[in-house]
């Protein structure tokens, strides 16, 4: 039920990568507005974007105080002009959305190269730990501090002559590879968390090859 | 060199909760380790409890999840074991552990290299 | 959960004699998360072999490990009065992290 003038929303999907995590759904609004709520782990309802024209809203403030919990929002929409207007049941329409466990579910970001250098015939690759919104006693926790062990980091490495990749995989966001002496290698990373069921892995890091400013060498 | 030093009662009353505390000392708690929990029941093999990293993150074994806490202070350079409703099933020797970064096949893994040397704890009324 | 099996229970060899342990694990196991410790009575286990083949630092090279998927070896070439002592394997690769249930080495 609802006004004759006011359309549920639809199509409720969650957007989120290393934690950063928003709400989007349709349709886009025509004279109408939305409020969004999403429920804490109290199972109150919170008011967030209220009375937005935008099809889309920011919940990682709250999703990141609680990266285990598993969250539900809803989409209320509400005639222009009239954000306290209800249906004929007394309550605006609204959509929920599925239910999201961050933990579980934020899309790993693509991992970065933060630096290689070689010693001999070994090389030592570092992955970067990005920081993500979770805090825990007032600071930003990195990836690795939120993951833990669950997060592992493939390395895909090849001579810059060749097309023949190998691997390597690690438990930090260190590797030390052997490499052949006077060759030129390339590097890439992806992130993985083999518990996972769903978004398992992260996209490929950008390649870096020796020879590039990122890299070291000492004999 | 690190070592660890399990404290807490040796005699917990059924239906309580069992605490336990592990000293670190001669390293920092915040250096990239992570730090676990095992115990063993008398004459028996050892059980894996659960394991924390500085930032908090913990692993559980989902056996014991329900009743597994595991905390972190890294001011006094200590991780902690609750836990609770206890029963005789839970009489055993306590670890405490270290669990460090090793190279293997290209990346570095993690081992239990150290270890405390175990607090016995009894439930029984 | 995975669960590694031990075998034999126990071993009753002589000093100076070859032990050959075996764990076998319900499902693969990555190399990389396995290990072997050695446990002494009264005594927390001692770290002997990780990543199923590499020895821990200051643990004599009479101790190797081999072994990959589902089946693991502890080898003691010869077995010295110190060795005698029950041997855990253990993954750390999939929680829970498990041990196995032992093999007790003790003296013919």
């Known amino acids: 039920s609802g006004t004759t003038n006011t359309v549920a929303a639809y199509n409720l999907t969650w957007k989120s990568t290393n934690f950063k995590t928003i709400l989007e759904w349709e349709p886009k609004p025509v004279n109408q507005v939305y409020t969004v709520q999403i429920s804490d782990r109290s199972r109150n309802w919170k008011y967030k974007c209220t009375g937005t024209t935008d099809t889309e809203c920011d919940l990682t403030d709250e999703i990141v105080k609680d990266v285990n919990w598993t969250y539900e929002a809803r989409v209320l929409s509400y005639p222009a002009g009239n954000v306290e207007s209800t249906g004929s049941a007394g309550e605006p329409l609204y959509e929920n959305s599925p239910e999201f466990t961050p933990y579980l579910e934020t899309n790993l970001g693509q991992p970065t190269i933060q630096s290689f250098e070689q010693v001999g015939t070994k090389v030592n690759v570092t992955v970067e730990d990005e920081r993500t919104l979770v805090r825990r006693n007032n600071t930003f926790l990195s990836l690795r501090d939120v993951f833990g062990k669950d997060l592992i980091y493939t390395l895909y490495y090849w001579k810059s002559s060749s097309s023949g990749k190998k691997t390597a995989k690690t438990n930090t966001n260190e590797f030390l590879i052997d490499v052949d002496k006077g060759e030129n290698y390339c590097f890439s990373v992806q992130a993985v968390i083999p518990s996972r069921t769903v978004n398992r892995k992260s996209t490929d890091s950008p390649v870096e090859c020796m020879g590039q400013e990122k890299g070291e060498f000492r004999e | 060199q690190v070592q660890l030093q399990e404290s807490g009662p040796g005699l917990v009353k059924p239906s309580q909760t069992l605490s336990l505390t592990c000293t670190v000392s001669?390293?920092?708690?915040?250096?990239?380790?992570?730090w676990s929990w095992i115990r063993q029941h008398p004459g028996k093999g050892l059980e894996w409890i659960g394991e924390?990293?500085?930032?908090?993150?913990?692993r559980y074994n989902p056996s014991l999840k329900s009743r597994v806490t595991i905390s972190v202070d890294t001011s006094k350079n200590q991780f902690s074991l609750k836990l609770s409703s206890v029963t005789a099933a839970d009489t055993a020797v306590y670890y405490c552990?270290?669990?460090?970064?090793?190279?293997?096949?290209?990346?570095?893994?993690?081992?239990?290299?150290?270890w405390g040397k175990g607090t016995t704890v009894t439930v029984s009324s | 959960e995975i669960v590694l099996t031990q075998s034999p229970g126990t071993l009753s060899l002589s000093p100076g004699e070859r032990a050959t342990l075996s764990c076998r694990a319900s499902e693969s196991v990555d190399s990389s998360y396995l290990a072997w410790y050695q446990q002494k009575p009264g005594q927390a286990p001692r770290l002997l072999i990780y990543?199923?083949?590499t020895r821990q630092t200051g643990i004599p090279d009479r101790f190797s490990g081999s072994g990959s998927g589902t089946d693991f070896t502890l080898t003691i070439s010869r077995l010295e009065p110190e060795d005698f002592a029950v041997y855990y394997c253990?993954?750390?690769?999939?929680?829970?992290?498990?041990f196995g249930g032992g093999t007790k080495v003790e003296i013919k």
């Open positions: 001669g390293g920092s708690i915040s250096s990239g380790q992570y």
């Open positions: 552990a270290r669990d460090a970064p090793y190279y293997y096949g290209g990346g570095y893994y993690y081992y239990m290299d150290v």
């Open positions: 253990q993954q750390a690769g999939v929680v829970p992290y498990t």
């Open positions: 924390i990293y500085y930032s908090g993150s913990t």
């Open positions: 990543g199923a083949s």
